[in-house]
Amino acid sequence: FERTRSLQDPCSNCPAGTFCDNNRNQICSPCPPNSFSSAGGQRTCDICRQCKGVFRTRKECSSTSNAECDCTPGFHCLGAGCSMCEQDCKQGQELTKKGCKDCCFGTFNDQKRGICRPWTNCSLDGKSVLVNGTKERDVVCGPSPADLSPGASSVTPPAPAREPGHSPQ
């Protein structure tokens, strides 16, 4: 079948990294610089993706595979194949349309990306707060008050220093 197909279509013999050149009697020509063909039998080579500006090259383009981009430090990839870069924030912050903002009281973010999430409500599981939450860390829940030995006490979260929902400036 392969022989029959190649007799009918000389282009099917052209391997990845080449294209079937109609201008040169359908011989297999190497892909020009900054282009590639990832499969055989191609009539054109595709232009490589350019990783420019906020993007940096994670993998160079070759004659058989496209370039791959990631983001420069201070940004992280979003979208299919890193089609966008989003600004990093610090732990304890989230990204809003106006930039990085500290997590509101009662919420935390332990990553440089994503949104602030509410602290775990230990009492919903019948547990007590063992370690208080911060902007960067969730609370740590301990055993339920009933599980504590006589005389032991659980850590009580301090009263909020400001109105819940207000973000420090």
């Epitope: 993706r49 906020v54 940004f75 979208g79 089609s83 966008m84 870069c85 989003e86």
Partner: antibody, heavy 123, light 106 residues
């Protein structure tokens, strides 16, 4: 608030040169990830990308204009420049500068545009 | 260069109509495509980036779709202020714009 203001347009003789300025405010041209480009539009025609400069100083140019164009910037003035040489009548257009990316997400699109400056090439 | 071909070049529509504009790339460009609206005497305005992400402040009647070589801008219910020229733009390799689609009043 991001603002881009072009200046330097006007009447230029064929064969001459133009130097356009784009004053940026609300952001710094040297901030990591920032790219600013020049795009032009001939009367009644579509948009044509000319070139781009990044925070790193790296530049990219349209292949059809590469031999005649230079994009530069002055970080102390937060200003971008376009130099175009050997002008022809076909270079008559409104020239826009535009910044890549949106507020917190950036990529290869133009979210902020200046109002444009008209360049007329005629004797 | 990567070429972008928009269709139609112009169209006539009425307020309330659903309008679809297509943009075809000469090769695959993943989702690295944006759409702009331009009114006479004004600078273009970004509507959609990354093929389908709506720019902040743009009405939700605008939407984008597609990946690879075929992309679409849809206006779900045309409003009087939407009569303008629309351009697609790729940034996959350098930058190029489509030739534009003029949306006129029927």
């Amino acid at each position: 608030e991001v603002q881009l203001v072009e200046s330097g347009g006007g009447l230029v003789q064929p064969g001459g040169s133009l130097r356009l300025s784009c004053a940026a405010s609300g952001f710094s041209l040297s901030t990591s990830g920032v790219g600013v480009g020049w795009i032009r539009q001939a009367p009644g025609k579509g948009l044509e990308w000319i070139g781009e400069i990044y925070h790193s100083g790296s530049t990219y140019y349209s292949p059809s204009l590469k031999s005649r164009v230079t994009i530069s910037r002055d970080n102390s003035k937060n200003t971008l420049y376009l130099q175009l040489n050997s002008l022809k009548a076909e270079d008559t257009a409104v020239y826009y500068c535009a910044r890549e990316g949106s507020d917190v997400v950036t990529g290869d699109w133009f979210a902020y545009w200046g109002q444009g400056t008209l360049v007329t090439v005629s004797s | 260069d990567i070429q972008l071909t928009q269709s139609p070049s112009s169209l006539s529509a009425s307020v309330g109509d659903r309008v679809t504009i297509t943009c075809r790339a000469s090769q695959g460009i993943s989702s690295v495509l944006a759409w702009y609206q331009q009114k006479p005497g004004k600078a273009p305005k970004l509507l959609i980036y990354d093929a389908s992400s709506l720019e902040s402040g743009v009405p939700s009647r605008f939407s984008g779709s597609g990946s690879g070589t075929d992309f679409t801008l849809t206006i779900s219910s045309l409003q009087p202020e939407d009569f303008a020229t629309y351009y697609c733009q790729q940034g996959y390799s350098l930058w190029t714009f489509g030739q534009g689609t003029k949306v006129e009043i029927k």
